[in-house]
């Protein structure tokens, strides 16, 4: 008894295709060894037609493939454009030769079944509608017209011109004529189901002079499209249901034991399991829409169906599209924390993975919002300026080439809690979801800046110090000047902080930044932070206001400083207005054109290409002069 198994008998029709699944025992050797499909000859020889090593015979060229699904211990042979010559005995098997483990499969390809010679064939998908054309002679114009469905014994009425309708076709069948043409009538049947498939006869008149026409209606269930995705990656279900359902609510559901459970619909329903990682995007007025799911999990694998109905729920006789999603656990996407925890007033540094082969791609960070159909407005990007409400507390650090970029958010509040996405304008599979949780702080922050209300006087020397605990002793400390294009790390020279020391004096651990002499351009947000190599850690922020010397107090309270931050930003608006104009000039600007939101998330079209410097640590327009010094004590 062979441990390989599959269908013993496969039958199909000329011109159609088959998909033969062969199962193999769950061992590492089996998963990686050669898979083959061969045809048995009279001599007992089995001639390879296709194998997983890339071999494809001439007779299968352009019409067959073999796909291995190691996590399911199966491989699938797909053969298209079948002919009667394909009828025969085959083997699917494993091993370096065709004498390895195998399973016998018999394939029979028949001619298209003979129908009465005048039969008209209509082939439609489930949920669609069909209009059957029934010609007749002029003398039968005044006579009754009808359509009936053939059963074993009789022909059961569907509809006739006296307005009789079979109960199972009420509201679905219409008999009509077009214009003044008295030689043809039509029957339209909508919301087709499998039960509607079969042979029909349309008739005008009675007795031997009646006009009759045979109709074969084939109602096809959509073939599930196979989607093969990596764990932690993302998938887009592109659903094209046609113009007739353009105004109906749309849904995506997953087949369960007895039902298809709705995951998301355009009426606001969303499965909690997909919170923070799903969007539904109406594409156009033709009934097209897409559903994007990020952060794929093993349990997301399964049979999905999209459809349209006013209820936003699956309904028999309405158009559908189906997919079989496989989630490959051998993922190229690194396993990162999906939940990041911060405290109020503190900071988080989020490492976002991207395809290392696409280091020059534009990187983005957006906040998932669940209202409506879900959307994800971009908060920061390598060439997208930081959103105004995140001024002074959000920056993206691109580390070219290492497959990671870092997003830092500080001055956290409980409002920041939620779901965020890392994404690029490159490989869409590398979209990842992070949940940010923010708890109330119960102790002092690790990094503290003094003085806290910082006002520097024009032309003078100004020093701010950042106190850090001993646990950060061995890490690199830095100051950077924040702008809405990033946080530019200021040059520092290390004065002995790296010297080996047995003890660490908690009170004396600080890194200082000195502005000498202070200029108007020095006004703005500054961050003090720690990092280890390319791994960023905690940060804290301070706003430094710059004033001309006055006789009165030089103290400015933080609210004024923040107000001034806004002013400083507005003075820089010239740049951003240019970039907005450039955005508008881009044809098909893609997901980020619409108010910087990820709308058509499935499209990897040209992204928002705002002008200006990149938001990387080294991409600032203003170089810092030697007046900025860091002193480590």
């Amino acid at each position: 008894k062979s441990p390989i198994f599959g269908p013993q008998e496969v039958s199909s029709i000329e011109g159609d295709s088959v998909s033969i699944t062969c199962y193999y025992p769950d061992t590492s050797v089996n998963r990686h060894t050669r898979k083959y499909w061969c045809r048995q000859g009279a001599s007992g020889m089995c001639t390879t037609l296709i194998s997983s090593n890339g071999y494809l015979s001439k007779e299968y060229s352009g019409r067959a493939n073999l796909i291995n699904f190691p996590e399911n211990n199966t491989f699938v042979i797909n053969i298209e454009q079948l002919t009667q010559d394909d009828t025969g005995s085959y083997k699917c098997g494993l091993g370096t030769s065709n004498r390895g483990l195998s399973f016998d499969v018999s394939l029979e390809v028949s001619q298209v079944p003979e129908l009465p010679s005048d039969t008209h064939v209509y082939t439609k998908d489930i949920g669609r509608n069909v209009t059957i054309e029934c010609p007749f002679k002029r003398e039968n114009a005044p006579s009754k017209k009808s359509l009936c469905k053939k059963t074993n014994q009789s022909c059961e009425l569907v509809i006739d011109s006296t307005e009789k309708v079979n109960p199972s076709y009420i509201g679905r069948a219409k008999l009509f004529m077009k214009g003044t043409d008295l030689t043809v009538f039509y029957v339209n049947i909508s919301h087709l189901t499998h039960n509607d498939a079969g042979l029909y006869i349309c008739q005008a008149g009675e007795g031997p002079s009646a006009d009759k026409k045979n109709v074969d209606l084939q109602v096809l269930a959509p073939e599930p499209e196979l989607l093969y995705k990596d764990l932690r990656s993302s998938v887009t279900f592109e659903c094209d249901l046609g113009r007739e359902v353009a105004n109906e609510a749309k849904y995506l559901c997953r087949m369960n034991k007895e039902t298809c459970d709705v995951i998301i619909n355009t009426l606001g329903k969303r499965d909690p399991d997909f919170e923070g990682r799903i969007l539904i995007t109406p594409k156009d007025d033709n009934g097209r829409f897409s559903v994007l799911i990020t952060g794929l999990r093993k349990e997301d694998a399964g049979h999905y169906q999209c459809g349209a109905h006013s209820s936003g729920l699956p309904q028999e006789g309405w158009p559908i599209q189906t997919w079989q999603l496989f989630v490959n656990e051998e993922s190229t996407i690194p396993n990162r924390r999906s939940v990041v925890k911060g405290v109020t007033g503190g900071s988080v540094a989020i490492a976002c993975p991207y395809n290392p082969k696409e280091s020059s791609s534009l990187k983005y960070w957006c906040r998932w919002e669940g209202d409506g159909n879900g959307h994800c407005p971009v908060l920061v990007g390598t060439q997208a300026q930081v959103q105004e409400e995140y001024e002074g507390r959000l920056a993206l650090f691109d580390q070219p080439g290492n497959g990671t970029y870092t997003v830092i958010l500080n001055q956290l509040t409980t409002e920041d809690a939620g779901f965020y996405w890392c994404l690029t304008n490159g490989d869409s599979r590398w979209r990842t979801t992070i949940e940010l949780q923010v708890a109330e702080a119960t102790r002092e922050p690790n990094l503290e800046v003094t003085p806290q209300n910082a006002t520097a006087v024009l032309g003078e020397t100004f020093t701010v110090s950042c106190h850090y605990p001993c646990k950060f002793y061995s890490q690199e400390k830095y100051w950077c000047k924040w702008s809405n294009k990033g946080c530019h790390i200021l040059p520092s020279h290390d004065e002995g902080a790296r010297q080996s020391s047995v003890s660490c004096d908690q009170s004396s651990q600080l890194v200082s930044m000195t502005l000498n002499p202070v200029s108007k351009e020095d006004e703005g947000w500054y961050w003090c932070g720690v990092k280890q190599g390319q791994t960023y850690g905690e940060t804290t922020a301070i706003y430094i206001a710059v004033e001309e010397r006055t006789r009165g107090s030089s103290h400015v309270n933080p609210t004024d400083a923040n107000a001034r931050a806004k002013v400083a930003l507005e003075e820089e608006v010239v740049d951003s207005s240019i970039s907005e104009k450039e955005n508008k000039a881009i044809p098909n600007p893609g997901p980020f054109a619409n108010e910087r939101e990820i709308q058509n998330v499935g499209d990897q079209a040209q992204e928002n290409r705002a002008s200006g410097d990149a938001g990387s640590a080294d991409g600032q327009s203003r170089s810092s002069s030697s007046k900025h010094h860091h002193h480590h004590h």
Epitope: V10, S17, E223, H303, P314
Partner: nanobody, 127 residues
Framework: EVQLVESGGGVVQAEDSLRLSCAAP????????MGWFRQAPGKEREFVAA??????????YYGDSVKGRFTVSGDNAKNTLDLQMKGLKPEDTAVYYC??????????????????WGQGTQVTVSS
């Protein structure tokens, strides 16, 4: 409520034939695969045969002990399933269960892979 209803069971002599039928009117959609299992007293449920549909192609699967003797057929539009059993042996005595819609990934020979089940029909083959 999904119901699979088997019929056609009975008592026959060895080498006789019998035809089992299964109707699944309550399935929420057309099943892509339906099958037969059997369970003899004190034994595990055993895979007998299955049929799968895709487009206009049909796939038939048989358990090793019935290959060549049993033929599975059905209509996926109507969710009906038949099992023609010829050359019956006393060891074919069991309760025969109809099953529908297995997990796409699962080994269809294991009962755990199938979603819907009938109540079963008794087949007794006397020697």
């Amino acid at each position: 409520e999904v119901q699979l209803v088997e019929s056609g069971g009975g008592v026959v002599q060895a080498e006789d034939s019998l035809r089992l039928s299964c109707a699944a009117p309550g399935l929420p959609f057309s099943s892509s695969r339906m099958g037969w299992f059997r369970q003899a007293p004190g034994k595990e449920r055993e895979f007998v045969a299955a049929i799968g549909w895709s487009g206009r192609s049909t796939y038939r699967y048989y358990g090793d002990s019935v290959k060549g003797r049993f033929t599975v057929s059905g209509d996926n539009a109507k969710n009906t399933l038949d099992l023609q059993m010829k050359g019956l042996k006393p060891e074919d005595t069991a309760v025969y269960y109809c099953a529908a819609d297995p997990d796409y990934y699962g080994d269809y020979r294991t009962s755990g892979a199938w979603r819907y089940w009938g109540q079963g029909t008794q087949v007794t083959v006397s020697s």
